[in-house]
Amino acid sequence: LSEEADDTDSELGSMKPLHTFCAMKADDGPCKAMIRSYFFNMYTHQCEEFIYGGCEGNENRFDTLEECKKTCIPGYEKTAVKAASGAERPDFCFLEEDPGLCRGYMKRYLYNNQTKQCERFVYGGCLGNRNNFETLDECKKICENPVHSPSPVNEVQMSDYVTDGNTVTDRSTVNNIVVPQSPKVPRRRDYRGRPWCLQPADSGLCKASERRFYYNSATGKCHRFNYTGCGGNNNNFTTRRRCLRSCKTGLIKNKSKGVVK
C-alpha cells in the first residue's frame, strides 16, 4: 500500500523520496508479459524505464514517466508547471507510430504530426518509442498544441506486425483482447486493487498448456485455468498464492488511506 507523503522533505533535490516504496528496486515480477513501465531509481534520483512482466512486482512501478515523477520526485509538480508554460513539443512527439514487439495488445495514444492530433494505436508491450501515451489526456497535454480543440480518436491497425501465421488487423479481435468484457466483473468502486485482477481468464494465443491461476473478482478467489503460452492478459499467475497475494488486497474492506497501485 502506498503511504501518505512525508512533507518534511518536499523541496526539489532532496535525497529523500516522497514515499518509502520509491526506494524499492525495480521488480519485473514472475509473469511473461512485457509492459513498458517506469520506476524511481534511488541512486540516480530519476524515473527510469523498465519492462514489467505483468503480475506481482512492487509499488515502485508506474504506467507513465509523469506519474512516476509526480509520485517520487519531491517538488516535481512545481517545476513541471513552469516547464509546461514553455509550450514546446518534445522531439519524441514527432516520432512515427511504433507498435513495438510482443503480444500485449495495449490501447495507447500517439501524436500524429500529419493530423496534429493525438490518436489511438495498439502497442505490443516491448520496445517501441516514446511517442506512446497511456491516456489521450496525457498525449494532448504533452504533444498537442493547446489551441487545438479536442479531436476524435482514430483507430490504427496493426499491419506493422509479423505474426505466426496471420497478421492481426481485425479491429474487433484486437479490441476483444485489449478490453475483455465480463458481466461478472464488479463495478470498479467495489474493488481498489490492480486493474488486471478484474479481467477474465484469457488463455492466450499459442498452443502450450500451462497450469495458471486467475483472480475471479466475483468470487474473490483464485481459480485454475490453462494458459497457451503467449498473449492473454495480466490476470495470470504461476501459483494460487501469488494470485491471492496480488489481487485479494484490493477488495473494498481494505480500510487503509493509501491506494493500491
Epitope: G100, C206, K207, G229
Partner: antibody, heavy 117, light 108 residues
Framework: QVQLVESGGGLVQPGGSLRLSCAAS???????GSWVRQAPGKGLEWVSV????????YYADSVKGRFTISRDNSKNTLYLQMNSLRAEDTAVYYC???????????WGQGTLVTVSS | DIELTQPPSVSVAPGQTARISCSGD??????VHWYQQKPGQAPVLVIH???NRPSGIPERFSGSNSGNTATLTISGTQAEDEADYYC??????????FGGGTKLTVLG
C-alpha cells in the same frame, strides 16, 4: 520466395568504416529488422534492431555509438553503418526479420566483415 | 540482464533422444526460441515461444521451459540433425540474448 540478401562486407582497417545492406524479396519488409553477428568459430551475438517505420533503434552495448541501423522501406532494404571498426568486430553479419514474438524468423545468408591491418 | 548458458557439446546415437539445455535466471518467465545452424549456413528457427514449431520443421523437434531450464528435445535423432543449436530470449535490459551454443554430434 521469402529471402534476405546481405551485401557490403569486406576487408577494412581498424578505425575504418563499412556500410552493410540487406535487401528483402518475396515479402514487404515493414516489420522490425535486426542485425546479428557471428565471430569466426564463436556464437551468435545480437547487434541492433530497428522498428518498421524506422522511428525506434536499439543497439548492443558493444556497438553503441559506433554503429547505426537504418532502413529505406521504399527499397525494402535494411542498412548497418559501421564506424570506428575494431578487430573484435570481425564476424559474419546476418540480417534478420524480427517476429512480433521476439524471435528471428527469416535470416539472410550473411556477409563477412574482416577488420585487420 | 539475462545470461543464457548452454552445454558446449552433446552427443547422441542415431535414433536416440537428444536433449539440449539452456539455463538462466527466471528463464521460465521468459519465452525461449531455438535455432539450428549447420556449418557455413545461416541459422534456422526450429522452435519459438518455448514449444512452438514453425512450419517445415520436423515433428521430432520439441521444446519445454520449466524449472530454471529450457530444453530442446530431438527425438529419433537423425544424422542430418548434427549442427550447432542456439537458444535465444528477449530481456528488458539487454534485448535479444543468445546462449553460447551447443554442438550436437550424432555418433556413428
Amino acid at each position: 520466395q521469402v529471402q534476405l540478401v546481405e551485401s557490403g562486407g569486406g576487408l577494412v582497417q581498424p578505425g575504418g568504416s563499412l556500410r552493410l545492406s540487406c535487401a528483402a524479396s518475396g515479402f514487404t519488409f515493414s516489420s522490425y529488422g535486426s542485425w546479428v553477428r557471428q565471430a569466426p568459430g564463436k556464437g551468435l551475438e545480437w547487434v541492433s534492431v530497428i522498428s518498421g517505420s524506422g522511428s525506434s533503434t536499439y543497439y548492443a552495448d558493444s556497438v553503441k555509438g559506433r554503429f547505426t541501423i537504418s532502413r529505406d522501406n521504399s527499397k525494402n532494404t535494411l542498412y548497418l553503418q559501421m564506424n570506428s571498426l575494431r578487430a573484435e568486430d570481425t564476424a559474419v553479419y546476418y540480417c534478420a526479420r524480427v517476429n512480433i514474438s521476439t524471435h528471428f524468423d527469416v535470416w539472410g545468408q550473411g556477409t563477412l566483415v574482416t577488420v585487420s591491418s | 540482464d539475462i545470461e543464457l548458458t548452454q552445454p558446449p557439446s552433446v552427443s547422441v546415437a542415431p535414433g536416440q533422444t537428444a536433449r539440449i539445455s539452456c539455463s538462466g535466471d527466471n528463464i521460465p518467465e521468459k519465452y525461449v526460441h531455438w535455432y539450428q545452424q549447420k556449418p557455413g549456413q545461416a541459422p534456422v528457427l526450429v522452435i519459438h515461444g518455448d514449444n512452438n514449431r514453425p512450419s517445415g520443421i520436423p515433428e521430432r523437434f520439441s521444446g519445454s521451459n520449466s524449472g530454471n531450464t529450457a530444453t530442446l528435445t530431438i527425438s529419433g535423432t537423425q544424422a542430418e540433425d548434427e549442427a550447432d543449436y542456439y537458444c535465444q530470449s528477449f530481456d528488458a535490459g539487454s534485448y535479444f540474448v543468445f546462449g553460447g551454443g551447443t554442438k550436437l554430434t550424432v555418433l556413428g
